[in-house]
Interface confidence: low
């Protein structure tokens, strides 16, 4: 039985410094008392505490873990929020800039072909969006569709334009010959590999950050287990029950203490690393044709090329289907199916050449050097957290869980510990399930990352990276080719800048599926400025 | 298979909200944009707007801007639609329609809002 | 008040064919897809026809659907009495930034 307290001693500090925590006092002893029923703060000798007072102390103690983990992982959460909205909107902008050069091409090469070709383009182009949105949808459907679309335009327009209108239920049948006659070549096939390789990684590596915000807002979000919750009271609250007011926990001790209460999300620090790399590797291996922004803003020209294509071989094409499709007018092949102005005309598809301007892949480069600085976060956790608390430096003169020691001794704290509660049972627990949930889907991000068919060991090329693969530049390989040879091929380097104001809208653009047969404008295929500006909208 | 389920009917005073609920399931909710469509009793439908459920951004008809407002949960894979300063002609049948570049493929089967005094 | 314009009614016997119009203006179907909806008695909607003439899975090649400039037009052969319904005609308006429907049509089969 401890002594009873001397006469002149009182509770009056820790009665001021609990009233703030919880207003009115009738909780707290006006003197010292046994504390029999204490579960926590076990005392040595009187204590200024009481059982009501410890729940409170718990309550506050875990809530306040909450924050310093939220605090510790604001920084990295925002980084990763900012660059998913950042990203989600510059590939909506290069997806309508490629709409717009594609309806350009088309108003200056083929009047005739539109409006139907804008719908069709419109059409293509919103399927791109909602493809890299995550939407279950086929690539190849996506682009069979666009050039099923465009054949009988271009056959009664172009090819075959004295058709009489009893004629034109040929529709359906031009649709079908399309593809049995390789009318386009293999351009559609080229297309097909070109787009559905750039979205499968570009909708991977959107998915793979909102995973990552995700990862950050479940650990962000964690309730912390009520053992922990003692644990910390323990080191941050009980020497205030014997009235020592201004001691720090040992720093030795909150390290202890911050392992076992974060056992469990320690736990996700082998996947994170995993992530972050296998997203590196996918960042590096998005060029040329595993870059959307490369390819769609290319595809006018394959687009064009294609179409050339038909040209050529149009009086072949025209008998054939003649007999194929039945309609009584037979025409003859002539040189009017040619437009007059057949090539693109470079006003209008100029990009003005900035140097050393920041692209999408410098942007998704530094990303990843940024997330590489958080490689670690998930297992520095503890030691972040106790260095942002307060602690006692050097461990000495500092509180260890249940006096004041000159001295923090990690063998002396654990046997004290013993009969209180037992520190590796804690961490034998294993993760919460949310934490087992968040692991299983990061597992599953990584497969996908990892699995991804993307060539392997990149070659940095200080020209490629500066300035960006250039679509006229073709290798042997047609499927890493961009665009085609000829006259009217325009290079348009990887070079898409930033509006400062990345979240503008166009509302015909932003109407789903049937909005975009809007004639662009000459002056609408501009360049982009000043993406390290940007204020998110998810900030 | 693809279900939305929209809540129940409801019964308003004039110058009350009302809040409609729409959950998806049998597809990508994120992936396809959710419309509201509203029909009064003997008459046509009219569109209100759409939500993207990606994003949450949303495109009101110029009718209803001021008074609509769409959001959605993507953790319940939920779209909800909020009219507010009601009045005796907006009773309804309110449909929640999912999108895509198809038109409205697949409907909810509809929410009756009285408006009554 | 709907801003693509439908007759109201339509009647024919079954076996027969039956046309319903829809017209609009050039910032409407002029410009975009024609899409075409049948609503069954006490029933949500149902997708007919999308992309002016194509028609989704489960619906039967008995509904066929044309455009033709500012107008479009669904058309029903071989009518048959579990096609009375009303039928909207809907497309995007560039001028209202939305979609716009047809007031229906009620199609009987006499």
């Known amino acids: 039985q401890p002594p009873p307290p001397p006469p002149d001693a009182t509770c009056h500090q820790v009665r001021s410094f609990f009233q703030r925590l919880q207003p009115g006092l009738k909780w707290v002893p006006e003197t010292p008392v046994p504390g029999s029923d204490l579960q926590v703060c076990l005392p040595k000798g009187p204590t200024c505490c009481s059982r009501k007072m410890e729940e409170k102390y718990q309550l506050t103690a875990r809530l306040n873990m909450e924050q310093l983990l939220q605090s510790a992982s604001m920084e990295l959460k925002f980084l990763i929020i900012q660059n998913a909205a950042v990203f989600q909107e510059a590939f909506e902008i290069v997806v309508r800039h490629a709409k717009n050069y594609t309806n350009a091409m088309f108003k200056n090469n083929y009047p005739s072909l539109t409006p139907q070709a804008f719908e069709f383009v419109g059409e293509f182009f919103t399927d791109v969006s909602l493809y890299i949105l995550g939407s279950d949808i086929n690539v190849d459907d996506m682009v069979n569709e666009l050039f099923d679309s465009l054949f009988p335009v271009i056959y009664t327009q172009l090819m075959n334009p004295g058709l009489p209108d009893s004629a034109l239920d040929i529709n359906e049948c031009l649709r079908g010959a399309r593809r049995d006659l390789k009318v386009f070549g293999n351009f559609p096939k080229l297309i097909m590999t070109q787009v559905s390789k750039s979205l499968q990684v570009t909708r991977i590596f959107l998915q793979a950050l909102n995973l990552g915000i995700e990862v950050i807002n479940t650990t962000d979000h964690l309730k912390f287990s009520k053992d922990c919750g003692r644990m910390l009271t323990r080191m941050w609250y009980c020497s205030y029950c014997q009235g020592l007011m201004m001691v720090k926990p040992c720093g030795g001790y909150c390290n202890v203490v911050m392992q076992g209460c974060m056992a469990g999300v320690v736990e996700i620090d082998k996947y994170w690393r995993e992530y972050i790399l296998s997203l590196e590797e996918l960042v590096n291996g998005m060029y040329r044709i595993y870059d959307m922004e490369n390819v769609l803003l290319g595809l006018f020209s394959t687009i064009h090329d294609s179409i050339q294509y038909v040209q050529k071989n149009a009086g072949k094409l025209t008998t054939t289907i003649g007999k194929l499709c039945a309609h009584s007018q037979q025409r003859q092949y002539r040189s009017a199916y040619y437009p007059e102005d057949l090539f693109i005309d470079k006003k209008v598809l100029k990009v003005a050449h900035v140097e050393h301007e920041e692209t999408l892949s410098s942007r998704r480069r530094e990303l990843i050097q940024k997330l590489k600085s958080f490689i670690s976060f998930y297992s520095a956790l503890p030691g972040y957290i106790c260095s942002h608390s307060p602690v006692a430096e050097n461990d000495t003169l500092c509180w260890n869980g249940q006096e004041l020691v000159e001295r923090y001794s990690q063998k002396a704290a654990r046997n004290g510990m013993k009969n209180q509660f037992n520190l590796h049972e804690l961490k034998m627990k294993g993760p919460e399930p949310v934490v087992s949930q968040i692991i299983d889907k990061l597992k599953h991000i990584n497969q996908l990352l990892r699995t991804m068919s993307m060539p392997k060991g990149r070659v940095l090329d200080k020209n490629l990276d500066e300035e960006g693969f250039e679509s006229g530049d073709c290798g042997d390989d047609e499927d890493e080719c961009i665009g085609g040879s000829g006259d009217g091929m325009i290079k348009v380097k990887n070079q898409l800048r930033f509006l400062a104001e990345l979240a503008y809208d166009l509302d015909v653009d932003d109407a789903p599926g049937n909005s975009q047969q809007a004639t662009p404008k000459d002056n609408e295929i501009s360049t982009f400025h000043n993406l390290g500006n940007v204020h998110s909208p998810l900030k | 298979q693809v279900q939305l389920v929209q809540s129940g009917a409801e019964v308003k005073k004039p110058g009350a909200s009302v809040k409609v609920s729409c959950k998806a399931s049998?597809?990508?909710?994120?992936?396809?944009?959710m419309h509201w469509v509203r029909q009064a009793p003997g008459q046509g439908l009219e569109w209100m707007g759409w939500?993207?459920?990606?994003?949450?951004?949303?495109n009101y008809a110029q009718k209803f801007q001021g008074r609509v407002t769409m959001t959605r949960d993507t953790s319940i894979s939920t779209a909800y639609m909020e009219l507010s300063r009601l009045r005796s002609d907006d009773t309804a049948v309110y449909y929640c329609?999912?999108?895509?570049?198809?038109?409205?493929?697949?409907w909810g089967q509809g929410t009756l809002v009285t408006v009554s005094s | 008040q709907a801003v693509l314009t439908q007759p109201p009614s339509a009647s024919q016997t079954p076996g027969q064919m039956v046309t319903i119009s829809c017209s609009g203006t050039?910032?409407?179907?002029?410009?975009?897809?024609v899409f075409w909806y049948q609503q069954l008695p006490g029933t949500a909607p149902k997708l007919l026809i999308y992309?002016?003439?194509q028609r989704p899975s489960g619906v039967p090649g008995r509904f066929s659907g044309s455009k033709s400039g500012t107008a479009a037009s669904l058309a029903i052969s071989g009518l048959r009495s579990e096609d009375e319904a009303d039928y909207f005609c809907?497309?995007?308006?560039?001028?209202?930034?939305?979609?716009?429907f047809g007031a229906g049509t009620k199609v009987t089969v006499l």
């Open positions: 809907a497309a995007w308006d560039d001028a209202l930034s939305g979609y716009v």
């Open positions: 992309k002016n003439f």
């Open positions: 050039s910032s409407n179907i002029g410009s975009n897809y």
């Open positions: 329609a999912r999108s895509w570049t198809s038109g409205f493929d697949y």
């Open positions: 049998g597809y990508t909710f994120t992936g396809y944009y």
């Open positions: 939500i993207n459920p990606n994003s949450g951004g949303t």
